[in-house]
């Protein structure tokens, strides 16, 4: 901690300006009034303070606001935000999206730090839900943000926020997350015509059940292989060869290149070889002709 020393004559800061970069740490502590610093925080960012000097400024703000900084100060923290610990941030009450954007801008281009994660958590909890504008902002800075949330956290995302989600925002989502997001997407994209709806819902189909895939197969949707490969294996397995052919349309030829990968590999093992042969793709590994297929799950249910 910086020792309390009197400010040298004539050095008392009247405003936050460039002259302060020549102040030693103890001079900043002694000569800069914390209340002045708080009201002129917007100027700090334009001045090339050293990290050590920023430490002093942070210390002054901490003394002035032991219960946590007010939003008027937080919004103008700029690079001083990088000096904050998650414990500091937990004391804040950030309600303005502009404040959130200003702080995310400081961290732009970097991985999500613990500070940023805490800030986002505080902000979202304060709002009560992850609304569209917030989601828009967060995915713009961190495209993988949505997929970093647990299924429980995702359950608080209102369907209207789904409009802000871009396909790339879902790239790293696992099936459990898509299970939560898919029904919300259905709710969000209601009352659309078939083709328009499919374009919108396509990115979320990794959470779709078999019944929905069967229904889509009747609509000439021509699903691409990339989407098909992201479908839940348990949802794909019950589909017949005819249904997969209808679902993929002209893209069905791509199955050959994916025959060793899930879910295609597992699906092939469940089909009769005769049926697979009708595709004319040379897919191998189906159930040989003449073999009886026992559905053990059905057998268990009956017993």
């Amino acid at each position: 901690e910086v020792e309390k020393t009197a400010c040298p004559s004539g050095k008392k800061a009247r405003e936050i300006d460039e002259s302060l970069i020549f102040y030693k740490k103890w001079e900043l502590e002694a000569c800069v009034d914390a209340a002045l610093l708080a009201t002129q925080m917007d100027r700090v960012n334009a001045i090339p303070f050293t990290y050590e000097q920023l430490d002093v400024l942070k210390h002054k703000l901490d003394e002035l606001y032991p219960q946590g900084y007010p939003e008027s100060v937080i919004q103008h923290l700029g690079y001083l935000f990088l000096k904050m610990s998650p414990e500091d941030i937990r004391k804040w009450n950030v309600t303005s999206l502009e404040t959130l954007k200003a702080l995310l801008e400081v961290n732009k281009g970097h991985e999500m730090s613990p500070q940023v994660a805490t800030l986002i958590d505080r902000f979202v909890k304060g709002r009560g839900q992850l609304d569209k504008d917030t989601l828009d902002t967060l995915t713009a800075f961190y495209p993988g943000y949505l997929c970093s949330l647990s299924p429980e956290e995702l359950s608080s995302v209102p369907p209207s926020s789904i409009w802000a989600v871009r396909p790339q925002d879902l790239d790293t989502c696992d099936p459990r997350q898509l299970d939560v997001l898919y029904p919300k997407a259905r709710l969000a994209f209601q009352n659309m015509n078939g083709s328009e709806y499919f374009v919108k819902i396509q990115s979320f189909l990794g959470g779709a059940p078999t019944e929905d895939l069967k229904a889509l197969s009747q609509q000439n949707v021509s699903m691409d292989l990339a989407t098909f490969m992201k479908l839940r294996t348990d949802a794909v397995l019950p589909l017949t060869v005819a249904e997969v052919q209808k679902l993929l349309g002209p893209h069905v030829e791509g199955l050959k290149a994916e025959e060793r990968h899930r879910p295609v590999r597992d699906w092939i093992l469940r089909q009769r070889q005769d049926d697979l042969d009708t595709l004319g793709l040379g897919l191998q590994g189906g159930i040989p002709n003449g073999y009886l297929v026992l559905d053990l799950s059905m057998q268990e249910a009956l017993s």
Epitope: Q190, M192, E211, D212
Partner: antibody, heavy 122, light 111 residues
Framework: EVQVVESGGGLVKPGGSLKLSCAAS????????MSWVRQTPEKRLEWVAY????????YYPDTVKGRFTISRDNAKNTLYLQMNSLKSEDTAMYYC???????????????WGAGTSVTVSS | DIVMTQSPASLAVSLGQRATISCRAS??????????VHWYQQRPGQPPKLLIK???NLESGVPARFSGSGSGTDFTLNIHPVEEEDTGTYYC?????????FGSGTKLEIK
């Protein structure tokens, strides 16, 4: 003819349980999302449970969450509502209602049953 | 939760005249292309029946004297000309998010 018929209502004591059924006919039941909607004695309509066509997704309002469970048996074309820890405020006419499909993606109720009456009283 | 407020609670309209029922949502329930509000009619002793879906689309089999309009938070159901069989209670419902909620109903009486 497209129709849904509810059954299983009756008089039950507070804290008790009841299971409602809804038999569907005249449409491809397994393709449709379904809901239960109730009407209180004061004639207010309240949505109480939703289930997706395959049964994988269910939703409830906070008033019944943890007490009511919606389920379906697509092989039997039947929708269920298991109601536990019943309260006097659950007294209502319970309607089974059809919603949309994965393709005809709508979220209004276009087919309603005649309802089954549930009275919770000591 | 979104609150759907209907007005008036009841109204009496002469045969052949216009009945206007309002429904106000506590927040916007519209996108740029669609409004997620639906209207139902309930005749005495019967279950509700869908009339209008997505604010202005007439359900199949519903007479053209029923019409719906509105967007954002304010929605209207119009019946013109009113007929004897239109006696009953009318409800609005939103499908914007879970939970779906209904208006408290407007009772229509034909004079």
């Amino acid at each position: 003819e497209v129709q849904v018929v509810e059954s299983g209502g009756g008089l039950v004591k507070p804290g008790g349980s009841l299971k409602l059924s809804c038999a569907a006919s005249g449409f491809a039941f397994s393709s449709y999302d379904m809901s239960w909607v109730r009407q209180t004695p004061e004639k207010r309509l309240e949505w109480v449970a939703y289930i997706s066509s395959g049964g994988g997704s269910t939703y409830y309002p906070d008033t019944v969450k943890g007490r009511f469970t919606i389920s379906r048996d697509n092989a039997k074309n039947t929708l269920y509502l298991q109601m536990n820890s019943l309260k006097s405020e659950d007294t209502a006419m319970y309607y089974c209602a059809r919603q949309g499909t994965a393709v005809k993606n709508y979220w209004y109720f276009d087919v309603w049953g005649a309802g089954t009456s549930v009275t919770v009283s000591s | 939760d979104i609150v759907m407020t209907q007005s008036p609670a009841s109204l009496a309209v002469s045969l052949g005249q216009r009945a206007t029922i309002s429904c106000r949502a506590s927040q916007s329930v519209s996108t740029s292309s669609s409004s997620y509000v639906h209207w139902y009619q309930q005749r005495p002793g019967q279950p509700p029946k869908l009339l209008i879906k997505y604010a202005s689309n007439l359900e199949s089999g519903v007479p053209a004297r029923f019409s719906g309009s509105g967007s954002g938070t304010d929605f209207t159901l119009n019946i013109h000309p009113v007929e004897e069989e239109d006696t009953g209670t009318y409800y609005c419902q939103h499908s914007w998010e879970i939970p779906f909620t209904f208006g408290s109903g407007t009772k229509l009486e034909i004079k």
